[in-house]
């Protein structure tokens, strides 16, 4: 503790100029004071001034008023500093002395004589209010006041609480009258060293180093750090926790970049054809009559469907066609006959059967021939049976579909996984992606197909934390940490209680 006992001398009256022994001062009592402050004693005794002592220079002769003086010799109020906890009680002895000697240092002069003394014993609380008193004896009167105040930076009832205002990283505060800390605006905590973050800043996902700030922890973003950051490279997906990539409807794959609903998103089929999804970015267009091509973008000749029967020849017109019928036939499609079996109308070994009592006929055609008169060789490719751009080829009595790369099946209707060919060497794991297969390589291998044995193993230093499995080769000199349940991050260093995560490319 630390404080100051202050004594203000106000007026001393010694009208007759007498000493305590009854003698008078000649030519007058040149008066100075000795003050002794000590611990409380019921009966004041001689002995050390345990709380301090002080002397004044000569302040006046016989009777005088003492003026306040802030510095130098004759300072008033008198200061008695102490470096302990103020006990609240004290004993004070004020003695008035006459000196024949030096005005400034009468204490050192020989022949000093006591004029009078007063003793005060009691309690005194720390405070700024002066306690005023007056003491009389038969010869003298002394008016004075006193108080105890704390030294700078000391506070409390006994000046025992040290507090120094500060504004640095170990505290941002001022001191209350009782010595407790009063945090500056924007700061909190026992020592006012914790900043108050931006209002609404997420308690777990954000923090701050100064007031009204919100710095996001890894995996979070936004003004209040309440928005998660999805998996790096996530295209058509969202997250509810960091590094997640939950695919939007119609999308799939590690990065939600594989289109599972190509038909809806891209409408690739033209001219009213029907689109059918068939796996990531796969689709099939079923054309309306009169159209062909992978996207039914090609308009067929109106005669392409061979509408003219019985050997009639077809001629294209602007929005239609016209059938030129051979002798013995008539109608829009030459479908009506004027012939009978007697006219041997069936070609290519077809058998003629009479109908309607011989007024018409029907031909029964041998294999590989068709038409009303068996005049047409069967073309099994006219119905465009091959899907996904496959080429149709007649093979005698049957036909085959020659499929484009990536498709298989009788009609090329099946999409082949790029990974089915096992393109990854050395035990690499294959992933079907938009631009072809991607291989995740085991430790010690890299390259697009894990075909390169690497001398520097990026996994050798053990970069993955929390029991994660390390892979290399996803891209040159990189590694992948496959995190166990409950950890995410490039090195699986963040515990977030996630479902098992995707590998993270470091």
């Amino acid at each position: 503790g630390s404080g100051i006992f202050q004594l203000r001398l106000q007026e001393f009256v010694n009208q007759r100029g007498m000493l305590a022994n009854g003698q008078s001062c000649e030519p007058g009592c040149r008066t100075f004071f000795r003050i002794c402050l000590k611990h409380f004693q019921a009966t004041f005794s001689e002995g050390p001034c345990t709380f301090g002592n002080v002397s004044t220079p000569v302040l006046g002769t016989n009777s005088f008023v003492v003026r306040d003086k802030n510095s130098g010799s004759g300072r008033n109020p008198l200061q008695l500093p102490f470096n302990f906890t103020w006990p609240g009680t004290f004993s004070l002895n004020i003695q008035a002395w006459h000196t024949p000697g030096d005005d400034l240092r009468p204490e050192t002069s020989p022949g000093n004589s006591l004029i009078s003394q007063i003793i005060i014993q009691g309690s005194l609380a720390v405070g700024k209010i002066w306690r005023t008193d007056e003491q009389n004896d038969t010869l003298t009167r002394l008016s004075y006041s006193y108080r105890v105040i704390c030294s700078d930076n000391y506070y409390g009832e006994s000046c025992s609480r040290l507090c120094k205002k500060r504004d640095d990283h170990f505290g941002h505060y001022e001191c209350q009258p009782d010595g407790s800390l009063s945090c500056l605006p924007g700061w909190t905590g026992k020592y006012c060293d914790q900043p108050i973050c931006l209002s609404g800043c997420h308690e777990q996902n954000g923090y701050c180093s100064k007031p009204d700030e919100c710095i996001c922890r890894p995996g979070w973003q936004g003004r209040l750090c309440n928005e998660c950051i999805p998996h790096n490279g996530c295209r058509h997906g969202t997250c509810s926790i960091p590094w997640q990539c939950a695919c939007d409807e119609g999308w799939g794959g590690l990065f939600c970049d594989q289109d599972l609903n190509y038909c809806t998103h891209h409408s690739p089929c033209k001219n009213g054809s029907t689109c059918s999804n068939s796996g990531p970015k796969g689709y099939t267009c079923t054309c309306l009559p009169g159209y062909t091509g992978e996207h039914c973008e090609l308009g067929l000749s109106k005669c392409a469907s061979n509408p003219c029967r019985n050997g009639g020849s077809c001629k294209d017109q602007e929005n239609s066609y016209h059938c030129l019928c051979p002798p013995g036939y008539y109608g829009q499609h030459c479908e009506h006959s004027t012939l009978t079996c007697a006219d041997s109308p069936c070609f290519n070994g077809g058998s003629c059967r009479e109908r309607n009592q011989g007024s018409s006929y029907a031909c029964e055609c041998p294999p590989n021939f068709t038409g009303s008169n068996c005049e047409k060789k069967v073309d099994r490719c006219t119905s465009n049976p091959c899907a996904n751009g496959g080429q149709c080829q007649n093979r005698g009595p049957s036909r085959t579909c020659r499929c484009r790369p990536g498709f298989t099946g009788t009609h090329c209707e099946l999409h082949i996984s790029d990974c089915a060919r096992s393109p990854c060497a050395h035990g690499g794991t294959c992933h079907d992606l938009e631009n072809g297969p991607v291989c995740t390589c085991p430790a010690g291998f890299s390259g697009r197909r894990c075909e390169v044995r690497i001398t520097h193993d990026a996994c050798a230093s053990g970069p993955c934390f929390n029991g994660a499995t390390c892979y290399t080769g996803l891209s040159p000199n990189n590694f992948v940490c496959n995190c166990p349940y409950g950890f995410v991050g490039s090195r699986c260093e963040f515990p977030v209680g996630l479902p098992p995560s995707f590998p993270w490319v470091a």
Epitope: L162, K164, S209, K210
Partner: antibody, heavy 121, light 104 residues
């Protein structure tokens, strides 16, 4: 009991960067009650405060060294580091890492044993 | 920049009182820490916040700070107290050490 241990090369060439790491054991560097500081002492001379860092990454540097100093923290490893660039012979010193307690008004109540770094070609 | 000045050396007889001063502009308005450093060892905090002793520091070490001067007092000095002593204060966000005093 918390212990601090400095590590790093004992010899650095002039104009290069001095790099030291302080590993904290027996307690978490993420405690909000402490700042983690670097102090150096040239041979036969007094102590010089270099700078300190809070676990969140807030840094404070000695203005006389600020342009050359970087202090960083890795809470996952319970470590903090010092980098001092463009060193000269005047940077030869014993480098200490220390824990500065908020409750002690910034007093350093825990020190590493120190590591001597000599700058010489 | 802020500076703290200490006497280079102080001599004391065993059992006597040693006083080490540390002066700086308005130092009494700042908290002062004191460190003891023996040869070949790391510094040890002996006083913080002007006059507080960390646990394990003997009662013979005490401190005070007012005006422009802080003082470390070692009463009943022992041979084991022979060491270098440094004062330290914070000026804004910067740590400042005194020049050090060798006590023999």
């Amino acid at each position: 009991e918390v212990q601090l241990q400095e590590s790093g090369p004992g010899l650095v060439k002039p104009s290069e960067t001095l790099s030291l790491t302080c590993t904290v054991s027996g307690g978490s560097i993420s405690s909000g009650s402490y700042y983690w500081g670097w102090i150096r002492q040239p041979p036969g001379k007094g102590l010089e405060w270099i700078g300190d860092i809070y676990y969140t990454g807030s840094t404070y540097y000695n203005p006389s060294l600020k342009s050359r100093v970087t202090i960083s923290v890795d809470t996952s490893k319970n470590q903090f580091s010092l980098k001092l660039s463009s060193v000269t012979a005047a940077d030869t010193a014993v480098y200490y890492c220390a824990r500065q307690a908020v409750m002690y008004g910034g007093g350093s109540d825990n020190w590493g044993q120190g590591t001597l770094v000599t700058v010489s070609s | 920049s802020y500076e703290l000045t200490q006497p280079p050396s102080v001599s004391v007889s065993p059992g006597q009182t040693a006083s080490i001063t540390c002066s700086g502009d308005s130092l009494g308005d700042k908290y002062v820490s004191w460190y003891q450093q023996k040869p070949g060892q790391s510094p040890v905090l002996v006083i913080y916040e002007d006059s507080e002793r960390p646990s394990g520091i003997p009662e013979r070490f005490s401190g005070s700070n007012s005006g422009d001067t802080a003082t470390l007092t070692i009463s009943g000095t022992q041979a084991m107290d022979e060491a270098d002593y440094y004062c330290q204060a914070w000026d804004s966000e910067t740590g400042v050490f005194g020049s050090g005093t060798k006590v023999t």
